[in-house]
Interface confidence: low
Amino acid sequence: EPPTACREKQYLINSQCCSLCQPGQKLVSDCTEFTETECLPCSESEFLDTWNRETRCHQHKYCDPNLGLRVQQKGTSETDTICTCEEGLHCMSESCESCVPHRSCLPGFGVKQIATGVSDTICEPCPVGFFSNVSSAFEKCRPWTSCETKDLVVQQAGTNKTDVVCGPQDRQR
């Protein structure tokens, strides 16, 4: 009796079970009663990453420099090319089809987490006692200068955007 289901890595065709092509190879012809499934390796710019019965391999992803992309990992016959973003850019989406510049943290905010190729800069407000006077994609909030340790006094209070201003102590005559 002809099979109604096949084992793993097989497929049912013309009432018989044929072997699937292994990753990196495409189907040329189905098996017959007398011959095995015929498969051919994908060409250099193509891949198939599963056991399959595809008659065409998939084209490797193109890491388009116009989109700020570069190759992170070159594709093989069994894997797709992995793109990442150029320095200073990160992916717009999980599939990394294009890149955008890292956000800078505005004055009053510091970098909590520096951007990576796949995630943007995470900024945080500078808490009391800290400041940032620059727009930067890598600078953390800096602590106010400690006037006391320099034997000076605070002449102007600090803010989240400015450091304290220290000055000499008024000497008693």
Epitope: D64, N66, L67, G68, L89, M92, E97, S98, C99, V100, P101, R103, L106
Partner: antibody
Framework: EVQLQQSGPDLVKPGASMKISCKAS????????VNWVKQSHGKSLEWIGL????????TYNQKFKGKATLTIDKSSTTAYMELLSLTSEDSAVYYC?????????????WGQGTSVTVSS | DIVLNQSQKFMSTSVGDRVSITCKAS??????VAWYQQKPGQSPKALIY???DRRTGIPDRFTGSGSGTDFTLTIDNVQSEDLADYFC?????????FGAGTKLELK
């Protein structure tokens, strides 16, 4: 600099649909996004949505979902917006506006606009 | 949706004056604001992006400033060719939204 050439003005009947084209003077659209913007007579600008020519991915303003459909033909570097089931409310000038990937929403380059009049 | 309020629909000015056009966002949009100039019968033209960066070819009498919710476009030494409508745009969040516009006219 990218030039965007839009199709000419159109007079259409209520209930009809129409398609506006936006042809870019670039060898390759890759690396640009194309936004579409509506300007009703004497009024401000409304963002309809954008399409990424690289993969045909679209993002719509919820208000225009079902009203506008954005498509792209990479081979001719032309973007299209189809407007469906037109009413008098859709009479306006429609612009395509493009920007480079490094700031995909800033709309650096604008087409000349396509005037659409919906009237029986 | 984020609303951009350009409270002055019209602003009167004279050639040589300095004028400031304001745009207030209903929530924090950081510096994701652009400014456009539109003359009658023409397409909008990009002037400023990311709140304060001037587009290539835009005269330096146009200056953008602000962050968070309050933004200003300042035109120093106004010229007759600057008489136009000015719109702000936020691109911090979808949907992108424009202000209602400020018309700059002669006194």
């Amino acid at each position: 600099e990218v030039q965007l050439q839009q199709s000419g003005p159109d007079l259409v009947k209520p209930g009809a649909s129409m398609k506006i084209s936006c042809k870019a003077s670039v060898y390759s659209f890759t690396g640009y996004t194309v936004n579409w913007v509506k300007q009703s007579h004497g009024k401000s600008l409304e963002w309809i949505g954008l399409i990424n020519p690289y993969n045909g991915g679209t993002t719509y303003n919820q208000k225009f979902k079902g009203k506008a459909t954005l498509t792209i033909d990479k081979s001719s570097t032309t973007a299209y917006m189809e407007l469906l089931s037109l009413t008098s409310e859709d009479s306006a000038v429609y612009y395509c506006a493009s920007s480079y990937y490094s700031n995909p929403y800033a709309m650096d380059y604008w087409g000349q606009g396509t005037s659409v009049t919906v009237s029986s | 949706d984020i609303v951009l309020n350009q409270s002055q629909k019209f602003m009167s000015t004279s050639v040589g004056d300095r004028v400031s056009i304001t745009c207030k966002a209903s929530q924090n949009v950081h510096t994701a604001v652009a400014w456009y100039q539109q003359k009658p019968g023409q397409s909008p033209k990009a002037l400023i992006y990311l709140a304060s960066d001037r587009r290539t070819g835009i005269p330096d009498r146009f200056t953008g400033s602000g962050s968070g919710t309050d933004f200003t476009l300042t035109i120093d030494n106004v010229q007759s060719e600057d008489l136009a409508d000015y719109f702000c745009l936020q691109h911090w969040n979808y949907p992108l939204t424009f202000g209602a516009g400020t018309k700059l006219e002669l006194k």
